[in-house]
């Protein structure tokens, strides 16, 4: 099922990302540089292990995980979080927890695009990727 996500993806549109980062608690300086970044996302699968790399002028990150198993993650904005990613109806649901807070990132395929929906409390950001 995760095969649909495999490949290299480039960010083509971003909506409400600054407001989402504010709600997450990201500081002004980090928001400024993160908001300017146009990351590529590289997703690969090796057996049970899924790897998601993000590459940009701002920060390069990489996470490798098994669905349903909690792992440690350092996010591009420098949060140290506990993450769990599950597959729910074809949607990769990524929950990050830190400092008593929680945010959910949903990655889903829509037509030829990969749509990433970031939710923190009542604030949602939608970022759309196309194949690079």
């Amino acid at each position: 099922m995760c095969d649909a996500f495999v490949g290299t993806w480039k960010l083509v549109s971003s909506e409400n990302f600054d407001d989402y980062m504010k709600e997450v608690g990201v500081g002004f300086a980090t928001r400024k540089v993160a908001g300017m970044a146009k990351p590529n996302m590289i997703i690969s699968v090796n057996g049970d292990v899924i790897t998601i790399k993000s590459e940009s002028t701002f920060k390069n990150t990489e996470i490798s995980f098994i669905l349903g198993q909690e792992f440690d993650e350092v996010t591009a904005d420098d949060r140290k979080v506990k993450s769990t990613i599950t597959l729910d109806g074809g949607v990769l649901v990524h929950v990050q927890k830190w400092d008593g807070k929680s945010t959910t990132i949903k990655r889903k395929r829509e037509d030829d695009k990969l749509v990433v929906e970031c939710v923190m409390k009542g604030v949602t950001s939608t970022r759309v990727y196309e194949r690079a």
Partner: antibody, heavy 119, light 108 residues
Framework: QVQLQQPGAELVKPGASVKLSCKAS????????ITWVKQRPGQGLEWIGD????????TNNEKFKSKATLTVDTSSSTAYMQLSSLTSEDSAVYYC????????????WGQGTTLTVSS | EVVLTQSPALMAASPGEKVTITCSVS???????LHWYQQKSETSPKPWIY???NLASGVPVRFSGSGSGTSYSLTISSMEAEDAATYYC?????????FGAGTKLELK
Amino acid sequence: QVQLQQPGAELVKPGASVKLSCKASGYTFTSNWITWVKQRPGQGLEWIGDIYPGSGSTTNNEKFKSKATLTVDTSSSTAYMQLSSLTSEDSAVYYCARLRGYYDYFDFWGQGTTLTVSS
Amino acid sequence: EVVLTQSPALMAASPGEKVTITCSVSSSISSSNLHWYQQKSETSPKPWIYGTSNLASGVPVRFSGSGSGTSYSLTISSMEAEDAATYYCQQWSHYPLTFGAGTKLELK
């Protein structure tokens, strides 16, 4: 270990310019903002501006926009602040500090450069 | 700009005394972006508490921080001689970055 090295002191004449340096080591220089802070004798801390070495992007305090110019040399992992048209009001200790992402606080500070503007 | 008002500006505490310093913020900020620094004379500031309540490396556990929205505080559960210093709050939630004017804490 993370270090920010600054010269101890600079003495310059009124009307001149000076370029203060801040050499970083112990981490990936391009991954964190570098901030400059001014402290006049017996006074509090005043933010001058930030520079992100990864892109050269800057964020400046409007008050210092015509006074301070921030640059970096990534090849030597050094941040610079040029202060122009110096007056006695510019005599102060100038600190550079590294900004830790997400929280955006200063997790490492240089020792500060004492700038004296005097004829 | 977001103004940070610290109180008191100057205070003295006896060894063992509980100390609370407050930082009032002119408009609401994220608690993740409110920080405290300790500075002793002739030295650079040191990160002391970040993200409202996280102690920086090496800070004694007698220190704590709390708050949200527009009201924040730094507390020392039991004053010690080495705590005598000036404490500054700082925010970088909204442009421009601002510091409080500082609270000078002396040993009585």
